[in-house]
């Protein structure tokens, strides 16, 4: 069973009156309709809330919306409707707010059919003031800020035009037509894929892929067979028709798409798809598709160009195109991801890696929990995560996986213990080591959040009743304390807090339902009298990450090196604070071939860690395309694995030479790249 | 094998100071934190501090606050610990101890010195 | 700091007995209690951490319960080699405290 609530677990003194002191009650004088919520800034303390209410009328739907503001983390929210002159906002479009503490955003607004085009209301001031802006074109999507500097946005029309704005949306230019998909990459270069003949759709396949780097003055045409195209990380992505039949490539930029490799992937047909999962400046996870309806693919993981990539994982779930995957970054441990494999029964299992991706096991049973119905051998068992997919499938599953950087080691999930995920309701577990060792955290679904760095986790039952008690913990779920936040249970529809979980507030929001009317509200509670205070040297202990044997020198080495953190000590109840940085000491450790993945043209035999050669290619020359030159690899086999830091050691030797020779990739060869100036 | 291996016993004079060391063999001395904990003869056992080598971070009980110091020399992996105005009650054995599980909260010393006799007296 | 109190401070036993320490701590700790061993001359072992987890190498016969302020260690059937002392250990907060300890001698 979970913690209880035993009258001595971590008791935390007089917080009743502590916390109603700080329980902070607005009721939204709206009619429910739906209600969209969006924080300005960072540490600002600025929400911006948006409710909308539609009623269907015979021949169209009359629709009104209201806009709130709080600059207290939703303590008190001040009626601000009348700045956008009472218009309807266009929910789809939700809350466009600028990067970083820009203090930008962008809400668009619902104009009648005959209109020349959209209307968008601009604010740059923490939403304290708006600009009403007509627009020159019908938005089909969002605003996107550049990332490097937030006066910069881009849009495509409804006539599939990319407009774009360098003065925060004032003033608007169409810089091309006929464009499908548009993404800011860095610098404020922006990739575009264009059809020719008739649509987006028609030409799929058929696309280009272009750049333009001075905001529409000038484009390259960076690629042609375009299927699509993505950015992950410091790579620039690309599928690509093959010239003989329906299959498609990946090819590969790290240079803007100057230049262009074949990814070392199996290239997938037409009812296939390849979708990266994660990527960072180092490598990137590809999943690659099944042929046919399986519901199911192939994990492979690459070198630091993109090119070569090592099998990671089989039978990884991913359900369609745009569908459900599992796959999940932990963000509170480096180098550990969490995803589902289908396995032969059609049972669905979890996996978890902590050498991203180099080797994939289950997840360990928790100490406090038995093996469910799904197990063969009752002392035998695996926890399996609930995630996307069990959230699509309409199961009892509230919430996805829950990790947090500035919370090291934590992560909260709900789950079921057996040999495989079950159907029956789950309960909430916790892992204080990034995965190593689970807990049962709570007893049945609930919603969860993290507050001031991981000091404060609180909880609320998912439930169909009405409810009116939140649960909270001081350390790390172990114990659990219930306050009652208001005597008139609510209907309960999210919890809502800072993102990066810095924050001492905590929001929930629902709705109160009369004979008559029904109601949002929201209840704000503030732990800053919970946590009284400030934490010391005293509060924080020691933790190597990742640390299995603790007798071992190389214990803790992930990927090149050991990290050693501060993390506060469970029974400490103080505050980590608002500006509260993580503190790690890295430390290099000895090379092994651990540290090592499979070159081109050699594979990891299982539980073996020495790579061979791949039978079909012993004896031949190992030849293969980088930057369309042919290119001859000297390897005994080894590529250190991306961001790899180790040193000494092991030392596999690897050579490349360039043959000089032209070879052929699908894609348009650097000479032939076209450009033209408007 | 963890092995935490102390300095000899000392006789010491009132008001004087003393230093022992404490040498850690086997894993990584950097991945825990060492504390102090003394045995005056016939008695219970005292906390007396704490170190962190790695992040040089130390901590003492309030009751020897001013009068110890702890101190740790990584490329050693030596923890040290000096105790001065010394005065007969602080006639003990004084233990070093390290934590094995490095996290969970857990303060619970799995590994111990041999002990270091210190015998204060005029 | 916190207070932590033992009984009984002795108790004499005979091997294949079943012997209960209790331990209190002056305010509640949630179950952040070790239990030592110590014999004569021999710096401590650790047996027992949070309140009942088992020390890898320690025999099952030892137990721990409690929570909060009360806290027993059980030895489910005494052995020769169990005669020694034992103390309890919060580390809920610093500073550290320790019991004054049992003394388990034969009967």
């Known amino acids: 069973s979970a913690p209880g609530e035993d009258e001595e677990c971590g008791r935390v003194r007089d917080f009743v009156a502590k916390l109603a002191n700080n329980t902070h009650q607005h009721v939204f004088d709206d009619l429910r309709g739906s209600v969209s919520l969006s924080w300005v800034g960072d540490s600002t303390g600025v929400i911006l809330v948006l409710t909308t209410f539609h009623v269907p009328l015979v021949i169209m739907t009359f629709g009104q919306s209201k806009l709130y503001r709080s600059e207290d983390y939703g303590k008190n929210f001040k009626d601000i409707t009348d700045l956008i002159n009472n218009t309807f906002i266009r929910t789809e479009f939700g809350m466009a707010i600028g990067p970083e503490n820009s203090g930008k955003v962008v809400l668009t607004a619902e104009v009648s059919g005959g209109s020349r085009g959209g209307r968008i209301f601009r604010s740059s001031d923490f939403a304290k003031n708006f600009v009403q802006t007509d627009l020159p074109f019908h938005p089909l999507t969002q605003m996107m800020y550049s990332p490097q500097n937030s006066d910069y946005l881009l849009a495509l029309s409804t006539e599939n035009g990319l407009w774009v704005s360098k003065n925060f949306g004032g003033k608007w230019e169409e810089i091309h037509k006929a464009v499908c998909l548009a993404k800011w990459g860095s610098d404020n270069t922006i990739f575009f894929t264009t059809y020719a003949n008739g649509s987006c759709k028609a030409d799929l396949g058929a696309l280009e892929l272009w750049r333009t780097s001075d905001l529409g003055k000038s484009f390259k045409t960076i690629g042609v067979k375009i299927y699509s195209f993505g950015l992950g990380g410091r790579f620039l992505f690309a599928s690509v028709m093959a010239d003989k039949d329906t299959t498609r490539r990946i090819h590969v930029s790290t240079d803007q798409g100057d230049t262009w490799s074949m990814a070392q992937l199996p290239s997938v047909g037409q009812e296939q798809f390849y979708s990266i999962l994660a990527a960072n400046d180092d490598m990137v996870f590809m999943h690659v598709d099944e042929p046919g309806d399986t519901g199911f693919g192939t994990i492979f993981t690459s070198d630091d160009r993109g090119i070569v990539y090592s099998k990671s994982l089989d039978r990884h779930l991913y359900t369609t195109t745009g569908g459900e995957t599992d796959f999940t970054n932990v963000t509170s441990l480096r180098g550990v991801y969490i995803t589902s494999v289908l396995s032969e029964d059609n049972s669905i299992q979890t996996m978890i890696t902590f050498d991203q991706g180099g080797r994939w096991t289950h997840l360990r049973k928790p100490e406090n929990s038995e093996c469910d119905a799904t197990a063969k051998n009752k002392n035998e068992c695996s926890l399996h995560i609930h995630a996307s997919y069990s959230i699509s499938q309409k199961l009892n599953v509230p919430m996805a996986p829950l990790s947090e950087p500035n919370a090291v080691g934590i992560v909260i999930a709900h789950g079921s213990v057996g040999d495989a995920i079950s159907v029956m309701v789950p309960d909430v577990y916790i892992s204080d080591d990034g995965g190593y060792s689970w807990t049962k955290m709570l007893e049945g679904p609930h919603y969860y959040t993290i507050l001031d760095s991981g000091g404060i986790i609180v909880a609320i039952e998912h439930s169909s009743r009405p409810i009116n008690v939140i649960k909270f913990s001081t350390d790390e779920g172990q114990c659990w304390q219930t306050y009652t936040f208001t005597r008139d249970p609510i209907y309960f529809t999210g919890l809502a807090s800072e993102p990066g979980a810095r924050s001492m507030n905590i929001s929930i929001w629902g709705f109160t339902e009369s004979f008559l009317t029904s109601q949002w509200v929201s209840y704000t509670i503030d732990f800053k009298d919970i946590l009284e205070r400030n934490c010391e040297e005293k509060d924080y202990t020691i933790w190597l990450a990742h640390s299995t044997d603790p007798e071992d020198y190389e214990d803790g080495c992930i990927l090149g090196y050991k990290e050693q953190f501060l993390r506060l000590r469970k029974s400490s109840v103080c505050q980590n604070g608002r500006d509260y940085v993580v503190t790690k000491q890295p430390s290099i450790c000895l090379c092994s071939l651990e540290d090592f993945l499979c070159d081109f043209g050699y594979y990891r035999p299982e539980n073996d860690s020495k790579c061979v050669e791949q039978p079909e290619l012993k004896g031949h020359d190992l030849e293969f395309c980088l930057y369309g030159r042919e290119e001859h690899l000297t390897t005994n086999g080894y590529r250190k694995i991306p961001g790899d830091k180790c040193q000494g050691g092991v030392n596999p030797v690897r050579e490349v030479k360039d043959l000089k020779k032209k070879c052929t990739s699908n894609f348009l060869s650097p000479e032939k790249q076209n450009s033209k100036s408007n | 094998q963890v092995q935490l291996v102390q300095s000899g016993a000392e006789v010491k004079k009132p008001g004087s100071s003393v230093k022992v060391s404490c040498k850690a063999s086997?894993?990584?001395?950097?991945?825990?934190?060492i504390s102090w904990v003394r045995q005056a003869p016939g008695q219970g056992l005292e906390w007396m501090g704490r170190?962190?080598?790695?992040?040089?971070?130390?901590n003492y009980a309030q009751k020897f606050q001013g009068r110890v110091t702890i101190t740790a020399d990584k490329s050693t992996s030596t923890a040290y610990m000096e105790l001065s105005s010394l005065r007969s009650e602080d006639t003990a054995v004084y233990y070093c101890?390290?934590?094995?599980?490095?996290?969970?909260?857990?303060?619970?010393?799995?590994?111990w010195g041999q002990g270091t006799l210190v015998t204060v007296s005029s | 700091d916190i207070q932590m109190t033992q009984s009984p401070s002795s108790l004499s036993a005979s091997v294949g007995d079943r012997v209960t320490i209790t331990c209190r701590a002056s305010q509640g700790i949630s179950s952040w209690l070790a239990w030592y061993q110590q014999k004569p001359e021999k710096a401590p072992k650790s047996l027992i951490y949070a309140t009942s987890s088992l020390q890898s190498g320690v025999p099952s016969r030892f137990s721990g319960s409690g929570s909060g302020t009360d806290f027993t260690l059980t030895i489910s059937s005494l052995q020769p080699e169990d005669f020694a002392t034992y103390y309890c250990q919060q580390y809920n907060s610093y500073p550290i405290t320790f019991g004054q300890g049992t003394r388990l001698e034969i009967k």
């Open positions: 101890a390290r934590d094995r599980r490095g996290f969970s909260g857990y303060e619970v010393f799995d590994y």
């Open positions: 170190i962190i080598p790695i992040f040089g971070i130390a």
């Open positions: 086997g894993g990584t001395f950097s991945n825990y934190a």
